[in-house]
Structures are given as C-alpha cells and as structure tokens.
C-alpha cells in the first residue's frame, strides 16, 4: 500500500497547526516539563510498512482523542482545534485504507500489539499528568510541545518508510 | 530559512550606552522566548538576558538593573538597551533562539545569530 | 544558580580517535542538558539536546549521555572539522548556565 502525497502533505499540515495553536511559550513552563517516556523505539527503522501501520493509526487516534475532549476544547482556539481535527481524520483514512488493503494484517501481531499498548500508555502517561495539573495553561503547552515533537519523529518514520520503497 | 541578525555593536566608553537589534526571519517570531548571550574575547559563553512570549524577562545578575531586553513582534526584532557599561560587558553579543520542535522542547538553543562585537573601552 | 563543570578544559587527539568529554551540574538538571560546537570566529551550533538526542544534521558520531547531575559528550572517530571547542549548557532553570568549554586540538 502507497500511502498518498497528500498524506505526507497533510503530515506537515498537521505539524503547522500544532504550533499555531501555541498560546503560551514552554519558555515561562520550565518547571511544568516532564518526560512521558515517548516510545520511540516502537516507532524505529527495524519495523517492516506492515509493523508500523496499525502503530502509527494508534498514534493519531490517540492525539485525535486527547484533543477532542471538553478540556481540549476549553484550552485551545475553536477554529485551529477543527481544522486538526480534519487532519488528524484524513492522515487516519489514510492508514485505514492500508490496513483495510491488507497491509499490516498479518505479519508479526504480538509485536504489533506490544507496540500499540506501548503507545496507549504513552497518552495514558499525558492524560494523568493534565489531570493532575488541573489542565492548567503551562500543562497544556507542556502537552502540545511533547505531541509536536513525538508526532514529528513519527511522521519522520513515515517518511523513512516511503524513501525506503 | 530561520535567521536571526544583530546590529548595533560598537566602542562605547565605559559608563556608557548601547542597543542591540536582532531582526528575526523564517519563523512565528512572536511566538518564540528570544535570549542574548554573549562571549568575552577569548571566553566562554555567557547567557545574559531572555524575554519570554509574553514579554516575561529574566536577567543574569552580573547585569541586572543596567541592560533592559524587549521585543517588538510587529518588527520581529529583539532589543537589549545596555547602560551604564563596563569595561568587563565586552564581548560579542548574539541573539539566540529554540524553534525546532525537539529543541523547542528541551530549550537547547538551536538558533544563533552571527554576532555584533561591543567594546567598552576608554 | 546551577553551576556547570566541564572537564578537560583542553584535549589533544588525531583524526580518528575516540573523544569523551564530561560534564557536571552542581544540582539534579534530569535530561535538560545541551551540548554546543563553536568553530573559531563562528557562533556556536547545536549538537545535542536532552542529553542524548541528536540534533538534526548533526553527524551520527556525536553522542550524548547521562542524566541527573553527570553526562558526557562522545565522538567516535574524530573528523577535520570537528576540532573546536564544545561547550554544555543547562536549560533546567533561569539563569541558564554554560559549562567553561573543552577545547578540541590536533594532536
């Protein structure tokens, strides 16, 4: 499965929302930073397309769903936050049209589970700390940068992948 | 392409005045903290002032109550007025940033001017 | 303030060597360590970033270590350019603070 120019585009997209929705710098949050442990390896060069598919539609679900809660709603800019949302919706088409084709299916599903529980406690990790910060300004910076940086060494992935075709 | 550019270095005298420009292109300059750190000749780097987005400052002692950093984000230029300078604030002043997404995070200071060299000397 | 201790203040090698330099925090900075490149007569570049992530287009025999209040800085196998001096800097807390500096000499 190829996935399209557009997906790779829309990547990018993704990216240049993420750091317009920035209201605070993380310069006056220095205090607030945290290390949610982001599980790069899951996302490493060894992984065949197959393996690495359903990990990265786990990635975007989960930034999908950490942004679209009420809390999310309230902290971020209306307009930004919609057109994220078509971005993140369109980028998971995308991979569910891969997975649908077959692809990741059926290679090596206990790695592949490993490395999708391995993401899910990753954003578990972001939701408890948001809670615990009480959703504060700074925590949701903290949150946005982490998602900014860990959903670029992703997309990097993904371009490692195509090149590598 | 991100650049960050100084002006405004010179000889001054000692007790004197100077200000540093640093004009930003490449990126949403407004919404980045800005530093100035500089290096006396044959020296080590000194961070001296920053300005956070929303125009918090934080000064090193060694020049708290004489430098003033300030940012204007229609100009996307970075200030720092220098009075009442000392012959030890020699140095070449640069005008420094984090913009990448990995930088940005952990604050490494990713983006560096060229410099402009103030000397205070009598 | 957090002060920063770099050690060697100077080191001689030759093109190919191996090259570790060290770097002490005087208090707990976690990860938030950086290390810096300057070239004479040019401003410093950024090699590392917490610790241990390479910055983009830094060369893959550059490699960061450590956490808490000890890292170090490696390169692998020594390259022309890569004689100048590197600095450490901690991004932990306000006022950031730089290491002294190692310079980087042919042997």
């Known amino acids: 499965c190829d996935l399209p120019q557009t997906h790779s585009l829309g990547s990018r997209r993704t990216l240049m929302l993420l750091a317009q929705m920035r209201r605070i710098s993380l310069f006056s949050c220095l205090k607030d930073r945290h290390d949610f442990g982001f599980p790069q390896e899951e996302f490493g060069n060894q992984f065949q397309k197959a393996e690495t598919i359903p990990v990265l539609h786990e990635m975007i679900q989960q930034i999908f769903n950490l942004f679209s809660t009420k809390d999310s709603s309230a902290a971020w800019d209306e307009t930004l936050l919609d057109k994220f949302y078509t971005e993140l919706y369109q980028q998971l088409n995308d991979l569910e049209a891969c997975v649908i084709q077959g692809v990741g299916v059926t290679e090596t599903p206990l790695m592949k589970e490993d490395s999708i529980l391995a993401v899910r406690k990753y954003f578990q990790r972001i939701t408890l700390y948001l809670k615990e910060k009480k959703y504060s300004p700074c925590a949701w910076e903290v949150v946005r940068a982490e998602i900014m940086r860990s959903f670029s060494l992703s997309t990097n992935l993904q371009e490692s992948l195509r090149s590598k075709e | 392409e991100v650049q960050l550019l100084e002006s405004g270095g010179g000889l001054v005298q000692p007790g004197g005045s100077l200000r540093l420009s640093c004009a930003a292109s490449?990126?949403?300059?407004?919404?980045?903290?800005m530093h100035w750190v500089r290096q006396a000749p044959g020296k080590g780097l000194e961070w001296v002032s920053a300005?956070?987005?929303?125009?918090?400052?934080y000064y090193a002692d060694s020049v708290k109550g004489r430098f003033t950093i300030s940012r204007d984000d229609s100009k996307n230029t970075l200030y720092l007025q220098m009075n009442s300078l000392k012959t030890e604030d020699t140095a070449v002043y640069y005008c420094?940033?984090?913009?990448?997404?990995?930088?940005?995070?952990?604050?490494?200071?990713?983006?560096w001017g060229q410099g402009t060299l103030v000397t205070v000397s009598s | 303030d957090i002060q920063m201790t770099q050690s060697p203040s100077s080191l001689s090698a030759s093109v190919g060597d191996r090259v570790t330099i060290t770097c002490r925090a005087s208090?707990?900075?976690?990860?938030?360590l950086n290390w810096y490149q300057q070239r004479p007569g040019k401003a410093p570049k950024l090699l590392i970033y917490?610790?241990?992530r390479l910055q983009t287009g830094v060369p893959s025999r550059f490699s960061g270590s450590g956490s808490g209040t000890d890292f170090t800085l490696t390169i692998s196998s020594l390259q022309p350019e890569d004689f100048a001096t590197y600095y450490c800097?901690?991004?932990?807390?306000?006022?950031?603070?730089f290491g002294q500096g190692t310079k980087l000499e042919i042997k």
């Open positions: 420094v940033s984090s913009v990448g997404a990995g930088a940005y995070y952990y604050q490494g200071l990713d983006v």
């Open positions: 490449g990126f949403t300059f407004s919404s980045y903290a």
């Open positions: 208090q707990d900075i976690f990860t938030y």
């Open positions: 917490d610790a241990s």
């Open positions: 800097q901690q991004s932990y807390s306000i006022p950031y603070t």
């Open positions: 300005i956070g987005a929303g125009g918090g400052t």
